[in-house]
């Protein structure tokens, strides 16, 4: 039996019975491999005199798709596995009604993790084996009986690496605004030593705790537009691979030396973090190389010092902050931590104190942005191939996918009240959630204009009373006269218009004689041609950027760089009275029409570019013979 962990106890906590809100009534048929843990889940917790509603979403980006686990098999050999298609129970989200709230919890065996409301960080964990509905303790970090932990990174080691520290560098940014740069990704490799394994008792328990820790670290870094993705986990279940010393600086050196040797046969990662069960000397709980991210020294050591995994998560976030170039807040004159003073300090405070921090200070953010300007930081720009451990659609990603009626983003980001952002189904009582024929979540009546006529080759479209989308854009029948030409698939192509498009406002069609021969590769005039449907010949205007030209007398043709192909006169261009270019020849307008289409539209519509009837407002396709209201009444009018 593994020795029990000498966990610190809670001084003061509140007992709550979480209540899971019922999921969507319309349940999708999901493949059986998707496991027991839903994509989204909500819980109500009655704590500190409030009912907090937590909306959680599975952290699908927790593990990289090449995620590996390494451990020692019973026969003593080292085994590396790539777990496939596993479900997991690690969630992130927010608290309803609190704009800057955050939550990071596991639901594997009851609820465990944290949720933040304003400056209050609430920790939650099960008190018994009763699962998610059983008794849970909700408490604040300062009520954990624990000694203050400090970071072993000294001011001396920081000074030369970080440069001068002045308040002027740190211009406060509004607390809720994300940095406007692209998201950065830390591909993380975690090593768990034998002491930690002995304390937790099994590979499964270690895996669970590490995923919980990384889920929390990821949530803390999201405020900085960073994601932390676990690409590998190594568990020393048999023996340590190097000496883990109570002196954190020795242990860090050993970790980085070992990592350098292993790097060729293990994951290519951006950062390595050791989690140890060894009690570091004094109050130190973590130690890191400063500004080492993306280098061979990118790593840190972390003592698992608290009963709640949020403790070591905060330590790891802090040490990773050093790897990303951050200094301790108290070393920086004028550094601002937005936290309420009594609620504790920011993540880069030199010592944790009695409560766990939950945000980065202004100066940490400034150090980070400065680090990201270095060429060295390039390894953070590549998004890992994120494993969507659970296949199929993802509700909340702004894309409508299989089984979804709408997807307006996650609840905290959705502004469409016709869409239930938790289920990606229509909201209660809504007929529609999108489309120009959808108003106030209801389908507009038939005959309402939804797309006006743009120009003389366009046709206007009307709502049909059944569908939220405006009917497909349709155009005047090909061959309908337009300014200087004939309509063709909604355009009015003429030689003059084509030359202007390429050569600018001064471009014009070249003399008719320019069109009377074809051009061979190398700008050589060749055989005579009888029409103007060959190479597009222009004069005047500005030569288009990045295009080669072929000049013969006053005739200018655009060619490819190698001179083998020329810009042709486009299909549908007028080449004479009642004539258009069609399949490279000047042909009669009749090529567009196989029959007298408009005669089939019963005087309630016109023929469109597809040779189909385009009905006037309120009349039903395909032949505009009946009113839409009659058709709907006959078939049942619900959309």
């Amino acid at each position: 039996i593994a020795p029990s962990r000498p966990w610190a106890l809670m001084e003061q906590y509140e007992v709550v019975l979480p209540w899971r809100l019922p999921g969507p009534r319309v349940r999708r048929a999901l493949p059986s491999h998707l496991g027991l843990h839903p994509e989204r889940v909500s819980y109500v917790l009655g704590a500190t005199g409030h009912n907090f509603t937590l909306h959680l979403r599975k952290n699908r980006d927790l593990l990289g798709s090449g995620y590996t686990e390494t451990y020692t098999a019973a026969n003593g050999s080292e085994v590396t596995e790539q777990p496939r298609g596993q479900d997991h129970c690690f969630y992130q989200g927010h608290v309803e009604g609190y704009p800057d709230s955050a939550a990071s919890l596991s639901t594997c065996a009851g609820l465990r993790g944290f949720f933040q409301v304003g400056s209050d960080l609430h920790l939650i964990e099960p008190l018994d084996e009763g699962g998610e509905g059983g008794r849970h303790a909700v408490y604040q970090a300062e009520h954990l009986l624990q000694t203050a932990g400090t970071c072993g990174v000294s001011d001396d080691s920081l000074g030369s690496l970080l440069g001068p520290r002045t308040a002027a560098v740190f211009r406060p940014r509004p607390g809720d605004s994300l940095p406007s740069r692209e998201t950065r990704y830390v591909e993380l490799y975690v090593v768990v030593d034998n002491a930690e394994f002995q304390m937790l008792g099994s590979e499964a328990a270690v895996r669970h705790r590490v995923l919980e820790v990384v889920n929390h670290v990821d949530k803390l870094y999201q405020k900085l537009n960073f994601r932390v993705v676990l690409v590998g986990l190594e568990i020393w279940n048999s023996q340590d691979r190097f000496h883990v010393s109570p002196d954190p600086s020795v242990t860090l050196e050993n970790l980085l030396t070992w990592q350098a040797r292993q790097r060729t046969r293990r994951h290519l990662h951006d950062n390595v973090q050791l989690i140890t069960g060894v009690d570091f000397t004094g109050t130190t709980v973590g130690f890191a190389r400063v500004s080492a991210m993306c280098s061979h020294s990118s790593g840190a050591v972390n003592q698992d010092h608290s009963k709640n995994p949020v403790g070591v998560a905060c330590t790891m976030a802090h040490e990773m902050g050093h790897n990303l170039g951050m200094d301790h807040d108290e070393n920086v004159q004028g550094c601002r931590c937005q936290e309420r003073f009594e609620a504790g300090r920011c993540i880069m405070a030199g010592s944790i104190g009695s409560s766990f921090p939950r945000m980065f200070s202004d100066c940490s953010q400034a150090y980070l942005e400065s680090f990201l300007e270095r060429p060295q930081s390039v390894c953070l720009a590549n998004a890992p191939d994120l494993s969507h451990l659970v296949g199929g659609p993802v509700c909340g990603n702004l894309f409508v996918e299989r089984g979804e009626q709408c997807d307006c983003g996650p609840p905290e980001d959705c502004r469409n009240r016709c869409c239930n952002s938790t289920t990606c189904q229509l909201a209660e009582g809504a007929q529609c959630a999108h489309g120009t024929c959808c108003q106030e979540c209801k389908v507009k009546p038939a005959g309402e204009l939804c797309r006006p006529k743009k120009d003389m080759c366009d046709l206007e479209e009307f709502c049909d009373g059944r569908h939220p989308e405006c009917p497909e854009d349709a155009f005047q029948e090909n061959g309908t006269p337009c300014s200087g030409g004939y309509c063709y698939n909604g355009a009015c192509p003429t030689l003059a218009q084509q030359c202007q498009a390429f050569w600018g406002p001064g471009g014009q069609a070249a003399e008719e004689s320019c069109f009377s021969y074809d051009i061979l590769p190398g700008c050589k005039a060749s055989r005579y041609r009888a029409d103007m449907c060959g190479v597009l010949q222009c004069k005047g205007g500005q030569q288009p950027l990045g295009r080669a030209i072929c000049i013969v007398d006053v005739c200018h043709a655009l060619t490819t760089e190698d001179g083998t192909a020329y810009e042709p006169v486009p299909e549908g261009t007028r080449c004479g009275p009642e004539k258009v270019c069609w399949k490279g020849r000047c042909q009669d307008l009749h090529v567009y029409r196989s029959s007298n289409c408009s005669a089939q539209c019963h005087n309630h519509g016109v023929c469109n570019h597809k040779q189909e009837c385009h009905c006037h407002a309120g009349w039903a396709p395909p032949h505009c013979a009946k009113l839409l209201t009659e058709v709907h009444a006959a078939s049942g009018s619900l959309p």
């Epitope: 409508v400 997807d407 307006c408 980001d413 959705c414 502004r415 469409n416 999108h434 489309g435 120009t436």
Partner: nanobody, 124 residues
């Protein structure tokens, strides 16, 4: 009416990077979800990436995941598409489009405002 102007396209070697920008004017920028789309020669138009008005939610499609990143700066009314490890098959005209978030349901048809496009050519 929202006006959108794309920039940053050009010719690049395979494996190279480009950063496209989409600048908007005409309405409150943060009220609009922005999408990047592309149309390669002889191909259908396809979605590339989308980002919510706040910038909190962003998604790239499977074909570009891990190589392209979408972000926005609401103070500058601009959305960016950072394209790394470019491949010849990424050659296309790239368009940005805007959809009002109050009416957004996740469909291409929600994007009512479109830019003119910027050409990206990736040579091997």
């Amino acid at each position: 009416e929202v006006q959108l102007v794309e920039s940053g396209g050009g010719r690049v070697q395979a494996g190279g990077s480009l950063r496209l920008s989409c600048e908007a004017s005409g309405r409150t920028f943060s009220d609009y979800i922005i999408g990047w789309f592309r149309q390669g020669p002889g191909k259908e138009r396809e979605s590339v990436a989308r980002i919510s008005g706040s910038g909190l939610t962003n998604t790239t499609t499977e074909t570009v995941k891990g190589r392209f990143t979408i972000s926005r700066d609401n103070a500058k009314n601009t959305v960016y598409l950072q394209m790394n490890s470019l491949k010849p098959e990424d050659t296309a005209v790239y368009y940005c489009a805007a959809a009002y978030s109050g009416h957004f349901s996740g469909r291409v048809s929600d994007f009512l405002y479109w830019g003119q496009g910027t050409q990206v050519t990736v040579s091997s």
